[in-house]
């Protein structure tokens, strides 16, 4: 596969991953009430996210409440907020770096410098995926640990919410996409024959021998 194709595919995956990460960050479904027992009738389900918690009644009515105080939040929520927002912002920066290093743009002159910029974009996406993975795994670990802890009240036990799964899928896309961008940049530097062909200038007049100047051909 050509470096340009790797670049495009990598960027598409990173953009989808970025969107998924924004969605995971905003959704109030990082943890959901665990239905451990059918003996006790639970008329409502509780969803908890990084920014708000929602109570869904059995009637389907949903009421959400944004967290009032940052200081009142648990350590893992505060850390998850910071790291997830950090990952989203890093992906934003990575997008511009990747576009600047892309072969189809003219922000940076073609050559080793441009390939290095493209490589930096890929690395930033990889870092973004890793950065997002930390709060997702940390949060999931706490939820699972508390679920199996016999000292935790039954109504305070939660299961992993959809946002965590979306987040994991997003980090996978960011890391695969970032990897492809790095591969594309590496291919570009090590195998220039696989990159976009150079822009042709108008051919000069034939020489006396009738040969065209071959410098524009690979």
């Amino acid at each position: 596969m050509g470096s340009a194709a790797l670049e495009i595919l990598g960027l598409v995956l990173c953009l989808v991953g970025w969107g998924g990460l924004i969605l995971a960050c905003g959704l109030p479904m990082w943890q959901v009430t665990a239905f451990l027992d059918h003996n006790i009738v639970t008329a409502q389900t509780t969803w908890k996210g990084l920014w708000m918690s929602c109570v869904v009644q059995s009637t389907g009515h949903m009421q959400c409440k944004v967290y009032d105080s940052v200081l009142a939040l648990s350590t893992e929520v505060q850390a998850a907020r910071a790291l997830t927002v950090g990952a989203v912002l890093l992906a934003f920066v990575a997008l511009f770096v990747t576009l600047a290093g892309a072969q189809c743009t003219t922000c940076v002159a073609p050559g080793p410098a441009k390939a290095r910029v493209a490589l930096t974009g890929g690395v930033l996406y990889l870092l973004c995926g890793l950065l997002a993975l930390v709060p997702l795994c940390w949060f999931a670990n706490i939820v699972v640990r508390e679920f199996y802890d016999p000292s935790v009240p039954v109504s305070q036990k939660y299961e992993l919410g959809a946002a965590l799964y979306i987040g994991w899928a997003a980090t996978a896309l960011l890391m695969v996409g970032g990897g492809l961008l790095c591969c594309g940049a590496w291919v570009c530097t090590s195998r220039p024959d696989l990159s976009f062909p150079v822009k042709y200038s108008a051919p000069r007049r034939p020489t006396a021998t009738g040969d065209y100047d071959k410098k524009n051909y690979v």
Partner: antibody, heavy 116, light 113 residues
């Protein structure tokens, strides 16, 4: 295992009071801890619980927003900050070790009287 | 909230007699996952703090004499003292240790006849 409460006494309605509980004989940070109160009127009543590191706290509805349970694992001490006290908060307050949602070791109790 | 109702509230028995204390919960707290009944029994002797006797309806705490027997399931539970001793004079409480708010029964006062 030993838990010893302190800080009780007479207090006027609307005022604050802080109870302490010094624990020994076990690894304090390995256990949930709780406060349970007892009054002739209401009998035994669970007040609040706190998890190992203090990141999770649980309260009985009537004390929610008024009482704050906290712990200092370095000092093996449990606290109960009681604000906006009411006459119905008059009781003997017990500090208890709280594994598996049980109360397996209790202190001797400390009397809190809310009266004008 | 789960309401715990104890009966009788007072009991006077002779040494050697068998004592039965009942506890009824307003709803079942039998865990469908592990089939455990989250009910505990406590003993509070005069002038002392409560002491845990039994948890999970029938599991005795270490050091608790085997004359104390816990039984029952669903919403109906029983604490049986197979042979009353003078040192068993106390108030006995049941408690659901399933979920918050953890609730106690009003107590059964046990005295010697």
């Amino acid at each position: 295992v030993k838990v010893v409460e302190s800080g009780g006494g007479l207090v006027q309605p609307g005022r604050s009071m802080k109870l302490s509980c010094a624990a020994s004989g076990f690894t304090f940070s390995d256990y949930f801890m709780a406060w349970v109160r007892q009054s002739p009127k209401k009998g035994l009543e669970w007040v609040a619980s706190i998890n190992y590191g203090g990141s999770r706290t649980y309260y009985e509805d009537s004390v929610k927003g008024r009482f704050t349970i906290s712990r200092d694992n370095a000092k093996s001490t449990l606290y109960l900050q009681m604000n906006s006290l009411r006459s119905e908060d008059t009781a003997t307050y017990y500090c208890a070790r709280h594994p598996h949602r049980l109360f397996d070791y209790w202190g001797q109790g400390v009397m809190v009287t809310v009266s004008s | 909230d789960i309401v715990m109702t104890q009966s009788p509230s007072f009991l006077a028995v002779s040494v050697g007699e068998t004592v039965t204390i009942n506890c009824k919960s307003s709803q079942s707290f039998l865990s469908s996952g592990n089939q455990e009944n989250y009910l505990a029994w406590y003993q509070q002797k005069p002038g002392q703090s409560p002491k845990l006797l039994i948890h999970l309806a029938s599991t005795r705490e270490s050091g608790v004499p085997d004359r104390f027997i816990g039984s029952g399931s669903g919403t109906d539970f029983t604490l049986t003292i197979s042979s009353m001793q003078a040192e068993d004079v106390a108030i006995y409480y049941c408690q659901q240790h399933y979920d918050i708010p953890y609730t106690f029964g009003a107590g059964t006062k046990l005295e010697l006849k």
